[in-house]
Amino acid sequence: GDLLIQKTIKKQVVLEEGTIAFKNWVKTGTEVYRQFWIFDVQNPQEVMMNSSNIQVKQRGPYTYRVRFLAKENVTQDAEDNTVSFLQPNGAIFEPSLSVGTEADNFTVLNLAVAAASHIYQNQFVQMILNSLINKSKSSMFQVRTLRELLWGYRDPFLSLVPYPVTTTVGLFYPYNNTADGVYKVFNGKDNISKVAIIDTYKGKRNLSYWESHCDMINGTDAASFPPFVEKSQVLQFFSSDICRSIYAVFESDVNLKGIPVYRFVLPSKAFASPVENPDNYCFCTEKIISKNCTSYGVLDISKCKEGRPVYISLPHFLYASPDVSEPIDGLNPNEEEHRTYLDIEPITGFTLQFAKRLQVNLLVKPSEKIQVLKNLKRNYIVPILWLNETGTIGDEKANMFRSQVTGKIN
């Protein structure tokens, strides 16, 4: 009996036309939502003038439906048993699941000012930037609508730069009508233990953002894993959002709509400093902000973001070192709300429920030559927003799963 089930599972999880896995893989049957909480700065004047702690108040959720588009350019390669595809991006605002509208205003760090002052450190260039910042009446902080902040706005300061630069700024700009990839993943035809594991991303086996093993593209995209998952496994996956591969470990058994699943979580060790977790040495890319690689819980992804000083963390700086959150008031990290987890059905390896949580932060540094930054006495890793991307298997699909998979085994 068990052998027959194993054989059936192996057949059905292959990523090729006609299998259950393929149908759900091309276009997810699960509704996926991305909730945003924006950190509204309460004391912009005090920060800019006196280098005070930044007082933030989160506002949200503002919810978008995402991942509703089918994979594009799906191409099987029989020679190396891979399938390649693009994952199109799309986001639709869901007013009924949101606390306000896309026109809501927020006081946030001026993204262009923070980024430009970081990218162009030459003193003479900074003097020019200063005059353009002042001329455009730009400041350290700005008021932007949710739509502008997420999806892009024309920046008045960048619009004055006398040589060609992208004048549109947004945390997720460009997003709609773009695609992530090309991904090339193993389809599992020759070896089921490799199914969904990424072979190449954008034509490469490495990212070119990190040194050594940190630069590797490991595992799947976390939507599924090879079948027959064991609790002892460390599940590796790659996330283009954070420009790195990461891993999850077993935490507990969970019952999801009558289906036994394994809850895997991202452990705090994955965010630790090299002092505590030597494997993380290659995620420490500079010595000053990281305090000689002793800070933890924030990931400098500037190399992946054209030099813009973007730092990724868990929401509210969960699992981050005290020095990171010390200059920010109003954060309340807690594991239940702010950690990432994957609920995996162990027989098929399918992720039936997940919550991916991350926070986008921007570094801003004092600058003698830029007036709106010259009163700062310290560096700040400024939280801009955090997001919670969730998906849960629908009731209908769960029934089908119970009858066809778990029901047959028990």
Epitope: T107, K135, K137, S139, F141, V143
Partner: nanobody
């Protein structure tokens, strides 16, 4: 003609009070953020207080916090600066300035301001 005019300056003893006015003509002040600056002899002009146009938010430099108060009377198209507990180091020429279109006024960058008054002298001396 667009104009800002300060008044109310003068000679006052340490510990005394003065109320400066900044009256606008040729434009409506309630659409503008208003800043007060001062320039002491031999020193650079410094921003001391402003009131934003959008939400009436105020900001005071540490040197005047708790002693000076800014307010606006839109009906009279005038902004006031009430100065209490004056000290000799408050001696300076006081200027008001108006900035349109900046709902995020978070500092005293002179280039932000579209219109300036001529200034009024404040002398604090016994």
């Amino acid at each position: 003609q667009v104009q800002l005019q300060e008044s109310g300056g003068g000679l006052v003893q340490p510990g005394g009070s003065l109320r400066l006015s900044c009256a606008a003509s040729g434009f409506t002040l309630d659409y503008y953020a208003i800043g007060w600056f001062r320039q002491a002899p031999g020193k650079e002009r410094e921003g001391i207080v402003y009131i934003s146009n959008s939400d009436g938010n105020t900001y005071y430099a540490d040197s005047v916090k708790g002693r000076f108060t800014i307010s606006r009377d839109n009906a009279k198209n005038t902004v006031y600066l009430q100065m209490n507990s004056l000290k000799p180091e408050d001696t300076a020429v006081y200027y008001c300035a108006a900035d349109q279109g900046s709902s995020v006024m978070h500092g005293f960058i002179e280039e932000w301001y579209d219109y300036w008054g001529q200034g009024t002298q404040v002398t604090v001396s016994s």
